[in-house]
């Protein structure tokens, strides 16, 4: 069986719809891909971070639709029967099973685009996604294994004397807490049902001459520091500054 | 629930004209395509042709001179006519359904007799 | 168009036996199987849709497997009332072939 070479150099496109929302896709120039496109004789599985309530376009292979006979999309989502949705050229038909969720949809008539969208990712649409072609000359594979990524909510206080508390909120996947300058610190971490995870770092610094310190948060949606004065009077609070 | 049911003549002469009736109930043509299929005594099961839930007509590359495929959505009904019979178009008669998940057929006809004898 | 050969023509096996089947298309038909069970006197009946899928109220001692080109058909545990003919049939286009029956 054959499959569609990814493109490694491949960029995320970003691009901004009317409706506001972010939009990304693995979509490939399409005469990049159909030259590199019967060189390979594996499936294409690619691990796909995507932002939740952006828009993501999957792609299937690049076959000319002429050479099409079937095209399938499988999506397995956790906790769910396996959705297909097909289209058949010769009676230009679609059938799909299982299929709940109105925002997975093809981008238009599959007679013209057989690409597959999601309307505003949500925390659900982690998974599995699967074109299947069938051409005269065998079936060709792309896979997703998409991930949805979610910001995680950052805050940072003092609770006690020269001890800081910083918090990454349910986050997608989990977050990392470093703080500058290095202290006494215990990380922890709370999983929820949904998936996300809410990490807790609590800081303690001995040294009198550390007056100012700084939670950085990294994250694959983006990093972000806080920076916390410390009060030497016990019990006091301070919220944090953004860097 | 589902149902579909052929009706026809049981009985045709050599070189007459076959039509047959595909009379469906519990869904509609426009939702789902139908097939009718062939097996001569003893045989195997042979595709004769379909009309797809757009009303698209398909036909078995052997037998297109002799056939036409139809239907009356208002009515539900699918119609075949094959000219020309033979001794050899004797066989069951089916209609099936395609599938609503794929292209399968998921609910078939009991199947008419049809025998070509003079 | 699609030739699909089935094998074996005929099997002698007895209750609670493992039975396997095979179909194989002439050319690449993805995973566009269905195999149907046909009883004497009856009208055939859907088993397997696209090659490994279990139809509806189908038990599970039926099973289907394959893609491309080669497709194989198991009963496990063989009961009484599985005596029947058994079809393979390619549904990727037109016209559809089916096997000669097991």
């Known amino acids: 069986e054959g499959a569609a070479q990814p493109n490694n150099s491949l960029m995320l496109q970003t691009s901004k719809e009317n409706h506001a929302l972010a939009s990304s896709s693995l979509c490939m120039d399409e005469k990049q891909i159909t030259q590199n496109y019967s060189k390979v004789l594996a499936e294409v599985n690619t691990s796909w971070p995507v932002k939740m309530a952006t828009n993501a376009v999957l792609c299937c292979p690049p076959i000319a639709l002429r050479n099409l006979i079937i095209i399938t999309w499988e999506i397995i989502l956790r906790g769910q029967p396996s959705c297909t949705k097909a289209y058949k050229k010769e009676t230009n038909e679609t059938k799909e099973t299982n299929c709940t969720d109105e925002r997975i949809t093809w981008v238009s008539r599959p007679d013209q685009n057989s690409d597959l969208q999601i309307r505003t990712v949500a925390i659900t649409h982690d998974g599995y996604y699967r074109c299947i072609m069938v051409t005269p000359d065998g079936n060709f594979h792309r896979g997703y294994h998409l991930q949805v990524l979610v910001t995680p909510e950052v805050t940072l206080f003092q609770n006690r004397n020269r001890t800081a508390v910083c918090k990454a909120v349910a986050g997608k996947p989990a977050a990392h807490i470093s703080w500058i300058p290095e202290g006494d610190c215990a990380t922890k971490q709370e999983y929820w049902s949904n998936g996300t995870v809410t990490v807790k770092s609590t800081c303690h610094w001995e040294v009198h001459n550390v007056s100012t310190v700084t939670c950085h948060v990294s994250h694959l949606t983006g990093n972000k520091s806080l920076y916390i004065e410390l009060l030497p009077v016990p019990g006091a609070k301070k919220s944090a500054k953004l860097y | 629930q589902v149902q579909l049911k052929e009706s026809g003549p049981g009985l045709v002469q050599p070189s007459q004209t076959l039509s047959l009736t595909c009379t469906v109930s519990g869904f509609s043509l426009t939702n789902n395509g139908v097939s009718w299929v062939r097996q001569p005594p003893g045989k195997g099961l042979e595709w004769i042709a379909a009309i797809s839930s757009g009303g698209g007509t398909f036909y078995n590359s052997a037998l297109k001179s002799r056939l036409s495929i139809s239907r009356d959505t208002s009515k539900s009904q699918v119609f075949l006519k094959m000219n020309s019979l033979q001794t050899e178009d004797t066989a069951i008669y089916f209609c099936?359904?395609?599938?609503?998940?794929?292209?399968?057929?998921?609910?078939w006809g009991p199947g008419t007799m049809v025998t070509v004898s003079s | 168009d699609i030739v699909m050969t089935q094998s074996p023509t005929f099997m002698s096996i007895s209750v609670g036996d493992r039975v396997t089947m095979s179909c194989k298309a002439s050319q690449n038909v993805g995973s566009n199987v269905d195999w149907y069970q046909q009883k004497t006197g009856q009208s055939p009946k859907l088993l397997i849709y696209k090659a490994s899928n279990r139809y509806t109220g189908v038990p599970d001692r039926f099973t289907g497997s394959g893609s491309g080109t080669g497709f194989t058909f198991t009963i496990t545990n063989l009961q009484a009332e599985d005596l029947a003919v058994y079809y393979c049939?390619?549904?990727?286009?037109?016209?559809?072939?089916s096997g000669a029956g097991t």
């Open positions: 099936a359904r395609d599938g609503d998940w794929d292209w399968y057929f998921d609910f």
């Open positions: 049939m390619q549904s990727l286009s037109f016209p559809y072939t």
